[in-house]
Interface confidence: low
């Protein structure tokens, strides 16, 4: 190889060892039979050399630096050439560096030909290995503007006081042009301006200078976005940190054409604007930092540009002004993340503050809209607290647990509507009465409706799940001792059509000691499957539950247990079951930790099944599944 550098070129070439790799054999640069691991060629020098190995690209890298001085003479503006030509260089990973020094009053503009640039962050790399690293200067301090790949939206970067531009080309890359030109501009009075041009739908991730380290103190950086008029842009902050400010406040400012409040000032922790039509600017302004404990300001954000959807022009009013202790959250369904461009899916408050999820609280009317390609990507979760603090006022008071019709007007699917029912401890209990009798979901007879009620204790220390219940069964009411949450969970869009089948009434009733009481009126046509709460995890220690099973006069009930034995092992206390005829009060007691469960038995009258747990040994829990069937009486036994 021969490299000759003209005396006036201001170019230096450096060949040096690259990142160490585990290679069996070393490789050297050979100059006049001498071996070296570094070669520096200065302006006016001409050097002949070769390598001692077949694949020098595995060992060495080459840096070509050109210093451009715009302080003492005219600046060579225009398209930047690769010098020396890549065809004259050895096939090593090469980095071309242009170091431009200029006066503070001169603005320098880097213009990138198509394909434009895409900024990437720490831990990322470019598919083709071609990277641009761009730095600026503040007095003597170098500031990293960012590292970029091809195929992006960044078309121009304006700086002042100097630019250091590095283009990294892998050894195998055939590129022989720099892909950018330099122009002079008037002073920009800030660290830099980055222009990002969108031709159509897409996204761009951008970062503050020096990211992920701190943005320079009290500096200003601007991004200019050029957006086709028919598209909409939304900004979301992916990652940010605030420094400790002594004077002024760190903020972002938006200049949005057509806005009457330009510039619009936001804190970094605010929800950022969405659904913006047309071009806009975003500026990051730092502050004077605390000298003792400065902290760092940094920002990584995404601009998403997409077609406005039909829904984005509609405003939906969610009226929670008459609701109390209610919150409604619209959020993304959990789905697999795809690697290709996925249009954003945002919910917007007052059409401007857009985010991937939104929580609305009671006491107000809210206006919302959507900026989303497919609203099935979102769902809605609602929580409502119904609490009683004064037992004298609440007793016998009833509330309807019904999804408000307002919610059905929204174009997103309801996932969960949870009512938290809170009662004064040891003073009141609760009873749930469904509009349609309920079926308990079991493996043997699963629910196949579009929604279910999930009933669980709402006492933080208590892990008690009563079960999942859906309309179309035999359970007439569920009484519970204390605080519970009732969650209506939907499983299919057809819930909207089946909404009339929902409806539970909760009443506050005098306190009772059992954890739960289920009132069951079996249907003559089918088996009623019932199981103990906390199925699969076991009935909690020392918990008691009962089933009040009604037997019509002309029927006989057969009570059957799924297993011969419960398998419960008591650490302390006893686990037992009482089956009591309601008419005669005759009862049988079974020790669940010792006795076998009773064989199928017939009841001619209504009866109780009561199960009380001991403190079971770990892994030997109490789970019981039983069923009741009705058959017509053949002989009147009354």
């Amino acid at each position: 190889f021969e490299i000759a550098l003209p005396r006036e070129s201001n170019i230096t070439v450096l060949i040096k060892l690259g990142t160490p790799t585990l290679l069996a054999k070393p490789c050297y640069i050979v100059i006049s039979k001498r071996h070296t691991t570094m070669l520096s060629i200065k302006p006016g020098e001409r050097i002949l050399f070769t390598f001692s190995c077949q694949s020098p690209e595995n060992h060495f890298v080459i840096e070509i630096q050109k210093n451009i001085d715009c302080m003492s003479g005219p600046c060579p503006f225009g398209e930047v050439q690769l010098q020396p030509s890549t065809s004259l260089l050895p096939t090593l990973n090469r980095t071309f560096i242009w170091d431009v020094k200029a006066h503070k009053s001169i603005g320098l503009e880097l213009q990138f030909s198509i394909p434009r640039l895409r900024q990437f962050g720490p831990g990322e790399s470019c598919p083709d290995g071609v990277t641009y690293s761009i730095s600026g200067r503040i007095d003597a301090t170098v500031v990293r503007i960012g590292t970029f790949c091809s195929n992006g939206t960044v078309s121009r970067i304006k700086m002042q006081e100097g630019v250091k531009m590095a283009l990294h080309l892998p050894w195998f890359h055939p590129r022989n042009v720099s892909g950018f030109s330099i122009a002079n501009r008037s002073s920009i009075k800030r660290l830099c301006i980055i222009e990002s041009v969108f031709e159509g739908e897409g996204s761009a991730t951008l970062m503050s200078a020096n990211y992920p380290e701190g943005f320079p103190e009290d500096e200003l950086m601007t991004w200019q976005f050029v957006i086709p008029a028919h598209l909409r842009a939304s900004v979301s902050f992916l990652n940010f940190n605030l420094s400790n400010c002594e004077r002024k406040e760190e903020r972002v400012e938006y200049y949005i054409p057509g806005s009457t409040t330009n510039p619009e000032v936001f804190k970094l922790e605010d929800k950022q604007p969405g659904n913006m039509a047309g071009n806009f600017n975003l500026s990051l302004q730092g502050c004077d930092q605390d000298a003792q404990n400065p902290g760092i300001l940094r920002l990584q954000f995404q601009v998403l540009v997409q077609h406005p959807q039909n829904e984005s022009n509609k405003i939906y009013v969610v009226d929670l002004s008459n609701e109390r202790a209610t919150s409604l959250t619209i959020e993304p369904r959990p789905v697999k993340q795809s690697r290709k461009f996925v249009p954003g899916c945002f919910v917007c408050l007052e059409s401007r503050t857009c985010s991937t999820n939104l929580t609305l609280t009671s006491g107000s009317k809210h206006k919302i809209s959507f900026l989303c390609d497919n609203l099935t990507r979102l769902w809605m979760n609602v929580e409502k607290n119904i609490s009683c603090t004064d037992h004298r006022y609440c007793q016998r008071k009833s509330y309807s647990l019904q999804v408000p019709s307002d919610i059905f007007h929204l174009p997103v699917e309801l996932h969960d509507f949870s009512w938290k029912l809170l009662v004064p401890k040891d003073r009141l209990s609760l009873v749930l009465v469904p509009a349609q009798k309920l079926q308990q979901h079991t493996h043997e007879k699963p629910c196949n409706t579009s929604f279910s009620y999930l009933v669980a204790s709402a006492i933080p220390s208590q892990d008690l799940y009563f079960g999942s219940f859906c309309p179309g069964g035999s359970i007439e009411q569920i009484q519970v001792k204390q605080n519970i949450s009732v969650t209506l969970r939907t499983f299919a869009p057809s819930f909207r059509q089946e909404a009339s089948r929902q409806g539970l009434t909760v009443s506050f009733i005098p306190y009772f000691k059992e954890e739960g009481v289920f009132t069951v009126t079996p249907d003559t046509k089918s088996k009623v499957y019932l199981r103990t709460p906390n199925w699969d995890r076991g009935l909690p220690s020392l918990t008691s539950v009962s089933w009040n099973i009604s037997v019509p006069r002309d029927q006989v009930a057969c009570l059957t247990f799924f297993k011969e034995r419960t398998g419960v092992v008591c650490q302390t206390g006893r686990a037992f079951m009482i089956i009591q005829e309601q008419r005669t009060r005759a009862e049988e007691i079974f020790s669940l930790d010792e006795d076998a469960l009773p064989k199928p038995r017939f009841h001619h009258h209504s009866f109780w099944v009561n199960i009380s747990n001991c403190s079971p040994a770990s892994g030997k829990q109490l789970d019981l599944l039983f069923w009741v069937t009705l058959t017509p009486r053949t002989v009147d036994l009354t």
């Epitope: 831990g123 990652n239 697999k336």
Partner: antibody, heavy 116, light 108 residues
Framework: EVQLVESGGGLVQPGGSLRLSCAAS????????MHWVRQAPGKGLEWVAS????????SYADSVKGRFTISADTSKNTAYLQMNSLRAEDTAVYYC?????????WGQGTLVTVSS | DIQMTQSPSSLSASVGDRVTITCRAS??????VAWYQQKPGKAPKLLIY???SLYSGVPSRFSGSRSGTDFTLTISSLQPEDFATYYC??????????FGQGTKVEIK
């Protein structure tokens, strides 16, 4: 060099709590999904929970939902697993792992024993 | 949840043998399957990602392939250090991530 170091394991009674830590070095946990995977003695691998702290995404296996909480402190470059209401069946070696191509970096594991 | 059924649960082989372990997904998981090696008392190590891509630093005797919902890990010539337990794992639906039951490769 990428490294993950778990700590916080030990013996705890059923119903008790533990907090596991996973200190990462050589990379920024903000940019990666961080996971906890456990392995009961003599058994296979079971995914427990994951977090992507930049987006605040968390997810849990059904077996731990409501009892375990995954979190991260990006300033300390550390992920955590808060385990409440522990049961005997939670006894396992708990590994913290980084995910990119797959679970490409794992910690050495920390043993959690739940026993009375 | 997607189940990953791995077979066999154990196998005996000699140094130099060609070893094949298979995993069947209960539904389509695209190519989102990885394979791991685990030695007693150690954390698992990633061998293959995206069904067939060899992870950096992994010897080329390990390879992965896919046919529909069937995934195969092949060790072309078993070495003494390859005696270990191997697991497949899917992450097509990000959650829950599921692993196969494991295959223990023992010395014959």
């Amino acid at each position: 060099e990428v490294q993950l170091v778990e700590s916080g394991g030990g013996l705890v009674q059923p119903g008790g709590s533990l907090r596991l830590s996973c200190a990462a070095s050589g990379f920024n946990i903000s940019y990666y999904y961080m996971h906890w995977v456990r392995q009961a003695p003599g058994k296979g691998l079971e995914w427990v929970a994951s977090i992507y702290s930049s987006y605040g995404y968390t997810s849990y296996a059904d077996s731990v939902k409501g009892r375990f909480t995954i979190s991260a402190d990006t300033s300390k470059n550390t992920a955590y697993l808060q385990m409440n209401s522990l049961r005997a069946e939670d006894t396992a070696v708990y590994y913290c792992a980084r995910v990119y191509y797959g679970f490409d970096y794992w910690g050495q594991g920390t043993l959690v024993t739940v026993s009375s | 949840d997607i189940q990953m059924t791995q077979s066999p649960s154990s196998l005996s082989a000699s140094v130099g043998d060609r070893v094949t372990i298979t995993c069947r997904a209960s539904q389509s998981v695209s190519s989102a399957v990885a394979w791991y090696q685990q030695k007693p008392g150690k954390a698992p190590k990633l061998l293959i990602y995206s069904a067939s891509s060899l992870y950096s630093g992994v010897p080329s005797r390990f390879s992965g392939s896919r046919s529909g919902t069937d995934f195969t890990l092949t060790i072309s010539s078993l070495q003494p250090e390859d005696f270990a337990t191997y697991y497949c794992q899917q992450s097509y639906y990000v959650y829950p991530i599921t692993f196969g039951q494991g295959t223990k490769v023992e010395i014959k």
